[in-house]
């Protein structure tokens, strides 16, 4: 049996011994100094790293690596110098003291030597790629830091040029604001000199307009005879109706809707304990006809039904007559509740309109009529006012005696004009009267000389259109 | 652009229950009354449920009152659908759907989301 | 609960076809009538509202009319693309009603 040992002696060379039979076999081989073991702290994978090492390491390490290849490629020639002269000593011992047999146990030795010498070669290998490896990545890395180099050279030109321009464009500029400065005195100058001639005119016009408002009271004066006579013969109408409904319904017990409550208007919602802002279902009268409306439950005791409102532009208000009839937009938003819905709500009891207004400079304004009511779609949805008060004008800006509702396509004006196509939206058009909160809305600092503005004349003046309005309803006994 | 994506939906024993939720983007969730509506298979569309927009009305038809329960959270713009005791009459794909504001005409829809009830 | 009911429950028509549907109410909806347009595996598609009013989009051969009780949607012309199965609603009161629907199907 064959038993193959390998340690080191005391000198720390390498000691291979065989024993055969009887036989023993010892080589010694010798260790080169500069030669490390694979158990050193130096590392094939040592070389191979993800960043590479600073430039003067990296030179340093190269020439370490290039004296271990010397060094290594020596101690090979040795060892095969070595090899070889044993080899003939042993072959003359054994030849001369082995019997035949021996021969098998000296390729043994010869193949195990030889496996090292293999071993030794391919590690070289390795450190050779890993040297080949490294030079790479330098020169790599010395070719980016050139061209990085160059490309900072560059900038720094591009901006310095920039800066020149920048320079260049700064005194044109200054030259042109001291040019401008001496062109704006003079057109100060001259505006206010347009100003105090404005003055003038404006005062002139003051004095005209006092003298015509006088003579519109004295005619408001005759009307209110008149009014007062029509809007009590209406009010006589509207209780007799109203008495009609009542009797009507205690004979139909249908309309009343057993699982569900049903609301009329918001005043009775808020009266039912929902005060909360927001949108509700109502319910037509004497139907079973559903609509949304919004309800303000805060402004003035609450209990409001909003029946339009304007506020950012987002609806477009030019509608159809079936439109303004059954109602458009969001009740979150900009909406008309609906002619049909309000006319039967405002003739089943007495109700008051509240009309709330606001500019673009920040004002808020009120008109409230003390009687509002719609007459039906075969009277074209008149409206009937009665008793103004409010911030938002002494005199009514929807005109007395109350108009027949106009839309586009349908034209039910006092004008020979069709004034919903020439001012939009649907209203009480006279001809074509002082308001119309349906028209165009314009936006802030576009909102001045627009003849198709949202216009209230008795607060903001003809060509003025305002920001936001919103028109809502109580009953009047709330 | 205004969404509606409904989850929830699966196969439940009789007399089980279910919860569907269906989350809603793209517009204002708490500006709008918020519906349920079914659609047994091969079958015609059959609404189920309304809710007001603060949650303060709800409305049912006879045939679910008593075992559904509608509810919204406007923090959330999600609006939900309890269903208890459930039966095989019950199976359908259940949209829910959003009305254009004044009138309930449903403009938008979910893709629907199949509820199966089955032993 | 308002009604409403559909005729036909189904009906087959070519490409080109003038094509129209019914819905009669079980009560006056003055014009509180939408019709919709669903085809398999999908939500329904507002068409009309209104009776008469066409959604943003629709194509104009899509056309409705009617009030009180009696209510029609016309196609004009029909198109490959409007095969399938159509539906009305009465938007008058609550709860919401639909028609049991209309199969439109290839000739």
């Known amino acids: 049996y064959n038993n193959f040992r390998k340690s080191m002696d005391s000198i720390g060379k390498k000691q291979y011994q065989v024993q055969h039979g009887s036989c023993s076999y010892t080589f010694l081989l010798p260790e080169m100094d500069n030669c490390r073991s694979s158990s050193s702290p130096y590392v094939s994978n040592a070389v191979q790293r993800d960043a590479p090492l600073e430039y003067d390491d990296s030179v340093q390490r190269l020439q370490v690596l290039e004296n271990i290849m010397e060094n290594n490629t020596q101690w090979l020639m040795k060892l095969e110098n070595y090899i070889q002269d044993n080899m003939k000593k042993e072959m003359v011992e054994i030849q001369q003291n082995a019997v035949q047999n021996q021969t098998a146990v000296m390729i043994e030795i010869g193949t195990n030597l030889l496996n090292q010498t293999a071993e030794q070669t391919r590690k070289l290998t390795d450190v050779e790629a890993q040297v080949l490896n490294q030079t790479t990545r330098l020169e790599l890395q010395l070719l980016e830091h050139s061209l990085s180099t160059n490309k900072l050279e560059k900038q720094i030109l591009d901006q310095t040029s920039e800066i020149n321009k920048l320079q260049d464009k700064n005194s044109f500029l200054e030259k042109k604001v001291l040019a401008m400065e001496d062109k704006h005195i003079i057109q100060l100058q001259s505006i206010k000199e347009e100003k105090d001639q404005l003055q003038v005119l404006v005062s002139k016009q003051n004095s005209i307009i006092e003298e015509l408002e006088k003579k519109i009271v004295t005619a408001t004066v005759n009307n209110s005879v008149l009014q007062k006579q029509q809007h009590d013969l209406m009010e006589t109408v509207n209780n007799l109706l109203t008495m009609m409904s009542t009797s009507n319904s205690a004979k139909d017990p249908t309309v009343a809707k057993e699982e569900q409550i049903s609301f009329r208007d918001c005043a009775e919602v808020f009266k039912s304990g929902h005060t909360t802002n927001g949108i509700y279902t109502l319910t037509f009268p004497n139907s079973t006809e559903e609509i949304k409306a919004y309800c303000d439950m805060e402004a003035g005791g609450g209990g409001w039904t909003i029946i339009q409102r304007r506020e950012d532009g987002s609806v477009d208000f030019q509608r159809t007559w079936k439109e303004y009839k059954v109602g458009f937009g969001n009740p979150s938003g900009e909406y008309w509740l609906g002619n049909e819905f309000v006319s039967q709500l405002t003739n089943q009891q007495r109700y008051v309109l509240k009309i709330h207004l606001k500019d673009w400079e920040g004002n808020e304004a009120y008109s409230l009529y003390e009687h509002f009511y719609l007459s039906s779609e075969e009277l074209n949805y008149r409206i009937h006012l009665k008793g103004l008060t409010g911030t938002a004008g002494k005199i009514s800006s929807i005109s007395q005696p109350g108009n027949d509702f106009s839309t586009k396509d349908g034209d039910n004006d006092k004008c020979i004009c069709k004034c919903s196509q020439m001012l939009t939206g649907g209203w009480w058009f006279d001809a074509c009267g002082p308001s119309n909160l349906n028209g165009m809305y314009y936006p802030q600092r576009q909102n001045t000389n627009k003849f198709n503005g949202i216009k209230w004349y008795y607060w903001k003046g003809s060509g003025y259109s305002l920001k936001a309005t919103t028109m809502m309803i109580r009953p009047a006994d709330f | 652009q205004v969404q509606l994506v409904e989850s929830g939906g699966g196969l439940v024993k009789p007399g089980g229950s279910l919860r569907l939720s269906c989350a809603a983007s793209g517009f204002t969730f708490s500006d709008y009354y918020m519906y349920w509506i079914r659609q047994a298979p091969g079958k015609g569309l059959e609404w189920v449920s309304t809710?007001?927009?603060?949650?303060?009305?709800?409305y049912y038809p006879d045939s679910v009152k008593g075992r559904f329960t509608i509810s919204r959270d406007n923090a959330k713009n999600s609006l939900y659908l309890q269903m208890n005791s459930l039966r095989a009459e019950d199976t359908a794909v259940y949209y829910c759907?959003?009305?254009?504001?004044?009138?309930?005409?449903?403009?938008?829809w979910g893709q629907g989301t199949l509820v199966t009830v089955s032993s | 609960d308002i009604q409403m009911t559909q005729s036909p429950s189904s009906l087959s028509a070519s490409v080109g076809d003038r094509v129209t549907i019914t819905c009669k109410a079980s009560q006056d909806v003055s014009t509180a009538v939408a019709w919709y347009q669903q085809k398999p595996g999908k939500a329904p598609k507002l068409l009309i509202y209104?009776?008469?009013t066409r959604h943003t989009g629709v194509p104009s051969r899509f056309s409705g009319s009617g009030s009180g009780t009696d209510f029609t949607l016309t196609i004009s012309s029909l198109q490959p693309e409007d095969f399938a199965t159509y539906y009305c609603?009465?938007?008058?009161?609550?709860?919401?009603?639909f028609g049991q629907g209309t199969k439109v199907e290839i000739k």
């Open positions: 609603q009465q938007h008058y009161s609550t709860p919401p009603t």
């Open positions: 759907a959003r009305d254009w504001g004044l009138r309930p005409w449903f403009v938008y």
């Open positions: 809710i007001s927009v603060g949650g303060s009305f709800t």
């Open positions: 209104w009776a008469s």
